[in-house]
Every structure is written in structure tokens, then in C-alpha cells.
């Protein structure tokens, strides 16, 4: 179960927005707050550990999951082309 | 079978640029993080670039970074490695290379190319 | 930097134990990577212990603790080649970049 703390926008900048999200999740042993269909949820903790994002399936049904190169985070891919990227801190 | 065939190396003066080319076939171009490994004469293997499925997000070895830039074209299923200001120490065979379940890291490579000779002199 | 020994002989039959320890801890595992003179790159495991289905069974991958080895079980003649390993490493300026050992040179007695 999970609940979401706070949530800044920010849409200063032209055809961006920049969204700032907190969660708190009540997780069993062994998993840990994370990203499911877009939504905040408790996901294996393991996933976290070992930065393979897209195994939490972060993005909603019909988008493609993309790993950042460095690991910080992944993208969001809509069919229609439009990139959402979520980093991770 | 995957095949990636690289193109575009030969002989290069010191400062100038070249472009790279690896097509890709035998797999899903779109669905998988490509990048670039080079190995000098005589010399072990060096990480070049690597770049994501979408094409949004790349990353440089330090040798190259700021003179490099890694792109895609997933119609044509052909990676892209632009180098410029080309120094003798570039010299090397540049192998493309494909990232295993969807992403790449230099401990989940499962196919190479053959690789393209670049030599840099005057 | 990845450390990995120079070389390493066996004789046919024998097994063949070619070690890598360094790089970062970025849970993708360990690369091994074997060269033939004059020939790309050919993957023989990837992701610690995960092997191409075009790559014999002799071939296999183990990690304990921060040491991570490649064996070759029943050495055969063709298996004689530099062996490289691949990791990550982690810097703040670049993030995880690809980093390979200098290669083992496997020599069949």
C-alpha cells in the first residue's frame, strides 16, 4: 500500500514538465516503494539494489520501458513517440 | 542469426572527423541498447559509447567524451558513431555492439560485429 | 579497472579457471569475451552466468564474492584465445561506463 506524499510541478519551461513526486508505501520484507503502471508501489527490493528499473514495469500499458545509460532512471516511451523520463534520487 | 556490419573506417588525418555505420539485422533494432567498443593495434578493449533503445539518452568513454556523438536510426536499423577532432591515438578497430534483455553494459554483450578499421595519421 | 592474470595454460581435457575481480557492484554481473587473432570479439557469457546458445556447455561463469571466474571444463584446442572480462565502472562525472579487463591469454598444452 502506498500513499503519495507530496507532488511539485514545475512547467516554466516550453513543452516540459518537470514533476517532482514522494511516496510513502507500507512494503513487505524484501521489497521496498517503487513505480508500477505509473503509479507508486511496493516492488522487490532487488530491483532497486541492482538499477534494472524496467523490471518494475514503472511504465502504463502500451508504453516501452528504456534504462537510462547511467542508470539513474528510465524513459517512457508513448506509442505516439512522446518520452517521459523519470530519474530516480 | 544477428548480424551487426560495421562501415565507414579508412584511413583519417589527425583532426578530422569520420562517421561510423553498423546495420543491424536477425533482431528487434528498437528493442535493444547498442553501443560501441574499440580495441588499438595490439591493445585490449576500450568502451567507446553506448546509447538507449529511444535514442534519448547516451553515454561516453572519457577517451572520446566531448568529440563523439552515438545515434540511431530504429527505421533503418542503423547505430551511428560520429567522431571529430580525430587524434592518432583513435586509431583503432571499432566494434559495434548489441545489449542482452534490453540493455547494454560491458557485462551484457551477446553479439559484435566484425568491426571497422580506423586508422588516424598524416 | 578490471584485474584478470596474464595467462593461463591447461592441457586438453583439463579445466581451465580464468579469474576477473574489480569494477562496480551494478548488479548486472560480469562479461567474458573470447578473441580469436585477427576476429572480433565472440561472447561466451554474459551477465555472470548466462550463455549464447551457439556457445559449447563446457564454457560457464561463477562469481563468489568479488572474485568472478570463467571455466572451461574439458579444454579443448580450439578454446585458445585471449579472454577478456567486462564490468562497469562508476564515476560521478560519467555514471557506469563499460570497463574490460587486459585480457587472459589461454594456452592449450
Known amino acids: 500500500t502506498c500513499e503519495i506524499v507530496t507532488l511539485d510541478r514545475d512547467s516554466s519551461q516550453p513543452r516540459r514538465t518537470i514533476a517532482r513526486q514522494t511516496a510513502r508505501c507500507a512494503c513487505r520484507k524484501g521489497q521496498i516503494a517503487g513505480t508500477t503502471r505509473a503509479r507508486p508501489a511496493c516492488v522487490d527490493a532487488r530491483i532497486i539494489k541492482t538499477k534494472q528499473w524496467c523490471d518494475m514495469l514503472p511504465c502504463l500499458e502500451g508504453e516501452g520501458c528504456d534504462l537510462l545509460i547511467n542508470r539513474s532512471g528510465w524513459t517512457c516511451t508513448q506509442p505516439g513517440g512522446r518520452i517521459k523520463t523519470t530519474t530516480v534520487s | 542469426a544477428v548480424t551487426l556490419d560495421e562501415s565507414g573506417g579508412g584511413l583519417q588525418t589527425p583532426g578530422g572527423a569520420l562517421r561510423l555505420s553498423c546495420k543491424a539485422s536477425?533482431?528487434?533494432?528498437?528493442?535493444?541498447?547498442m553501443g560501441w567498443v574499440r580495441q588499438a593495434p595490439g591493445k585490449g578493449l576500450e568502451w567507446v559509447s553506448a546509447?538507449?533503445?529511444?535514442?534519448?539518452?547516451?553515454s561516453y568513454g572519457s577517451a572520446v567524451k566531448g568529440r563523439a556523438t552515438i545515434s540511431r536510426d530504429n527505421g533503418q536499423s542503423t547505430l551511428y558513431l560520429q567522431m571529430n577532432s580525430l587524434r592518432a591515438e583513435d586509431t583503432a578497430v571499432y566494434f559495434c555492439?548489441?545489449?542482452?534483455?534490453?540493455?547494454?553494459?560491458?557485462?551484457?554483450?551477446?553479439?559484435w560485429g566484425h568491426g571497422t578499421e580506423v586508422i588516424v595519421s598524416s | 579497472a578490471l584485474t584478470q592474470p596474464s595467462s593461463v595454460s591447461a592441457n586438453p581435457g583439463e579445466t581451465a579457471r580464468i579469474t576477473c575481480s574489480g569494477g562496480a557492484s551494478s548488479g548486472y554481473g560480469y562479461g567474458w569475451y573470447q578473441q580469436k587473432p585477427s576476429s572480433a570479439p565472440l561472447t561466451v557469457i554474459y551477465?555472470?552466468?548466462e550463455r549464447p546458445s551457439d556457445i559449447p556447455s563446457r564454457f560457464s561463469g561463477s562469481s563468489s564474492g568479488s572474485t568472478h571466474t570463467l571455466t572451461i571444463s574439458g579444454v579443448q584446442a580450439e578454446d585458445e584465445a585471449v579472454y577478456f572480462c567486462g564490468n562497469d565502472d562508476y564515476s560521478s562525472d560519467s555514471g557506469y561506463v563499460g570497463v574490460f579487463g587486459a585480457g587472459t591469454t589461454l594456452t592449450v598444452l
Open positions: 555492439a548489441k545489449g542482452s534483455a534490453s540493455y547494454i553494459t560491458a557485462a551484457t554483450i551477446d553479439a
Open positions: 536477425g533482431f528487434t533494432f528498437s528493442s535493444y541498447q
Open positions: 546509447i538507449n533503445k529511444s535514442g534519448s539518452d547516451t
Open positions: 551477465k555472470d552466468s
